[in-house]
Amino acid sequence: EAHKSEIAHRFKDLGEQHFKGLVLIAFSQYLQKCPYEEHIKLVQEVTDFAKTCVADENAENCDKSIHTLFGDKLCAIPKLRDNYGELADCCAKQEPERNECFLQHKDDNPNLPPFQRPEAEAMCTSFQENPTSFLGHYLHEVARRHPYFYAPELLYYAEKYNEVLTQCCTESDKAACLTPKLDAVKEKALVAAVRQRMKCSSMQRFGERAFKAWAVARMSQRFPNAEFAEITKLATDVTKINKECCHGDLLECADDRAELAKYMCENQATISSKLQACCDKPVLQKSQCLAEIEHDNIPADLPSIAADFVEDKEVCKNYAEAKDVFLGTFLYEYSRRHPDYSVSLLLRLAKKYEATLEKCCAEGDPPACYGTVLAEFQPLVEEPKNLVKTNCELYEKLGEYGFQNAVLVRYTQKAPQVSTPTLVEAARNLGRVGTKCCTLPEAQRLPCVEDYLSAILNRLCVLHEKTPVSEKVTKCCSGSLVERRPCFSALTVDETYVPKEFKAETFTFHSDICTLPDKEKQIKKQTALAELVKHKPKATEDQLKTVMGDFAQFVDKCCKAADKDNCFATEGPNLVARSKEALA
């Protein structure tokens, strides 16, 4: 239904608090370097304007699109060119090209200092002084560092933050209460950020059809009792919502997401038996709960998939008549039977099925040709199962830090041209898959592992795209989204790489390492490990173990020394010499 004033419509639907939060997120994701105070001024101006449009939809400029209104606000910022360079060129364009231009300038790796969580006392003081400003800062800090973060979900995390601070700031030991709770929120939010980035990459590179296929598989796994038509409706809605958020239409995205939650709660009987608990919650929590819902029980009487898709004599006719519907039905039927598979795997199987029909339906005896298709799925299923088995075994043997190091060595050998910070970030994230997934029941491991790895590898691709340095990475990143993970897994040591020369300063450390938090210490060590592999890509596991063990002892010894600086200065060169010798 058309509205005279889109901005008035969204303000009324979302309410002032959520409206302001979403506008702040939008501005922070577009102009990532502006301070909070500058953005909040714009947010207040937009909010005041929206209120005038609510009062009178015919007021001046109220009929303008939200992109036009937001873009005009951003383009009016003084010194835009000084701070943002060529992004200012976007302002010479008309909508919708101007918004497209803004989107293209979003930076996945902005040059911002990592956000350091303040001490508990400081957080509580500032939160109690002004909760709105505190949470506004939270939205701003996260949104500018994650320009594709799913906006309505970020509002949910801000709400969680609010709950935690409200509860913990009255405790005597604020830090003991806050730290584990905020760590949990942060962990969930970081995973949400890479998952959403993957969705936007899918949308940007492969369009709505590819995303909708992903949504059909996911919904079918979650709601195996829903009819195909219901799954198609949900997938279409989810695709629209994600397209809006990825495209910067955050108000429409959040509004449509709330509408979808309402629809699902009104139609529980035809969707899933597991929704009721979610449907009793307020809007943000309801949507989040529905997005994380456990799988419904699979119907007991499902016939074999072969009946309709292999044994039926009309397979080629059905396929030819409506290819997308027939393939969608196949994906739905296969996915609802396999909550134990990753979405990536299900899409690979659907692709294999499609390729088989394309080939076989053009031949003389199609049924004989496609009759073995389900058996041909076996190697595609075994490959990720083996990946999960070997990696979880390695994780159980080495623990998270050791497993990260093993992954770091592996990926540095595959793509030694990639910058060390990017390799360390990717390996640390890939290495977390163990903690996240390997402790789950068997049936949940594969979807957890593969879909998480795919999202992390998408982040690697996005960063690599900015400054491409490795042909192998480019090749894996250019192909289909669902083939990425197998492509990276299949990479071996890059034989074309000319080893980096040994630079003593790369392995020179100072006493400042002693006071670093554990995480930062690990990153320092992992940086050294990646540099070692770049120097000696064919170093054996034992050689690397020896050098890294020696390095750990050296740091430990010097950090315990009375004169730390002197210890690092004298023992450091000895360590470098020993390392060179061990790797010779």
């Epitope: 956000f115 350091q116 400081a122 003081t125 500032s126 002004n130 505190f134």
Partner: nanobody
Framework: EVQLLESGGGLVQPGGSLRLSCAAS????????MSWVRQAPGKGLEWVST????????YYADSVKGRFTISRDNSKNTLYLQMNSLRAEDTAVYYC???????????WGQGTLVTVSS
């Protein structure tokens, strides 16, 4: 690493004004309560003023109340102290400090010298 860099000190006549600045870096500035502390020649440290994270609450020592104004600009990560009607007894090195808890400070600047003399 955390750095606090004061500036704006100098020689001023009694009754004159000065504005001190403190540029903060190496930490997220906005959630922290910040203070000014001074040390007159040969004397101990004296707390001057404190401001809450978003600037809605300010506190002053009786000796400067009505003459000094503390403020902050979180967008610039900067703390200020506007000093008016200066007196000879305001002569001191002025330090800005990051408050960690209940008027205890975990980081200080190097200080800026203010001399009030005719």
């Amino acid at each position: 690493e955390v750095q606090l860099l004061e500036s704006g000190g100098g020689l001023v006549q009694p009754g004159g004004s000065l504005r001190l600045s403190c540029a903060a870096s190496g930490f997220t500035f906005w959630p922290y309560t910040m203070s000014w502390v001074r040390q007159a020649p040969g004397k101990g440290l004296e707390w001057v003023s404190t401001i809450s994270p978003f600037g809605s609450t300010t506190y002053y020592a009786d000796s400067v109340k009505g003459r000094f104004t503390i403020s902050r600009d979180n967008s610039k990560n900067t703390l200020y102290l506007q000093m008016n009607s200066l007196r000879a007894e305001d002569t001191a090195v002025y330090y800005c400090a990051k408050v960690v808890k209940d008027n205890t400070f975990d980081y200080w600047g190097q200080g800026t010298l203010v001399t009030v003399s005719s």
